[in-house]
């Protein structure tokens, strides 16, 4: 099939890097400048992502494979591809409409993105607060009263946080 | 080709007023919240204001509340910000950005970049 294609379209030959240049007789030309072709057969080439702004180059592009942006620093990535860039906060504060703003009483957020979460009510497992929370940690849970009884020392961290969608106020 | 430019910066002295706009095409402007940054020597970018797509939500970051006011006009394709009382502190690159799609309800991350005009507040 695939030798019966190649004399059907002339293309199919093209390999990455190239296109079948229909002004040239079909020839495989190379890619021009800021631009590329991923797969063989193309009779154009795409233009190669620019990383402009708040984009940074994280890998430059190539006649075979598009540039890939990251963001500058203070930003974060966000969507397939790195498609948008959004601003870090502190930890102990969440990004809203109004900017970055500190975690209300009773929440945290341990990192420079995402929304602040509640912190772990240890009462639901039936132990009692160990250490604390804060803006930016979880409290740590400890046993309950009636487990500490000599010799026993059983401290349970709370779970690894997921990271949240944004729920902006 | 996407595209937002922006213009209006210059040298003005502390208390003076400028007024920047960028101006938007290649895409629907009527559909997306628009942004300023802006970065002052040495230090990082800043948010600075925003804008839903129909004007009924401004935000601005705590320090130039009060003097600057973000505005848009649709049918020109166009982002402004008014600044007024301008102090030396305000001496920074600005740049205008596109909310991307879902911005405000999901995220807050933009899109599309200007290439910066050069606000300096001296006297």
């Known amino acids: 099939f695939e030798r019966t294609r190649s004399l059907q379209d002339p293309c199919s030959n093209c390999p990455a890097g190239t296109f079948c240049d229909n002004n040239r007789n079909q020839i495989c030309s190379p890619c021009p400048p800021n631009s590329f072709s991923s797969a063989g057969g193309q009779r154009t080439c795409d233009i190669c992502r620019q990383c402009k702004g708040v984009f940074r180059t994280r890998k430059e592009c190539s006649s075979t494979s598009n540039a890939e942006c990251d963001c500058t620093p203070g930003f974060h990535c966000l969507g397939a591809g790195c498609s948008m860039c959004e601003q870090d906060c502190k930890q102990g504060q969440e990004l809203t409409k109004k900017g970055c703003k500190d975690c209300c009483f009773g929440t945290f957020n341990d990192q420079k993105r995402g929304i602040c979460r509640p912190w772990t009510n240890c009462s639901l497992d039936g132990k009692s607060v160990l250490v604390n929370g804060t803006k930016e940690r979880d409290v740590v849970c400890g046993p309950s009263p009636a487990d500490l009884s000599p010799g026993a020392s059983s401290v349970t961290p709370p779970a690894p946080a997921r990271e949240p969608g944004h729920s902006p106020q | 080709e996407v595209q937002l430019v922006e213009s209006g910066g210059g040298l003005v002295q502390p208390g003076g007023s400028l007024r920047l706009s960028c101006a938007a095409s290649?895409?629907?402007?009527?559909?997306?919240?628009m942004t300023w940054f802006r970065q002052a020597p040495g230090k990082g970018l800043e948010w600075v204001a925003h804008?839903?797509?129909?004007?009924?939500?401004?935000y601005y970051v705590d320090s130039v509340k009060g003097r600057f006011t973000i505005s848009r006009d649709n049918a020109k394709n166009s982002l402004y910000l008014q600044m007024n009382s301008l102090r030396a502190e305000d001496t920074a690159v600005y740049y205008c950005?596109?909310?991307?799609?879902?911005?405000?309800?999901?995220?807050?991350?933009?899109?599309?970049w200007g290439q910066g005009t050069t606000v300096t507040v001296s006297s």
């Open positions: 950005a596109r909310g991307g799609e879902g911005y405000s309800i999901s995220h807050f991350g933009v899109d599309v």
């Open positions: 290649g895409f629907t402007f009527s559909s997306h919240w």
């Open positions: 804008i839903k797509e129909d004007e009924s939500e401004k």
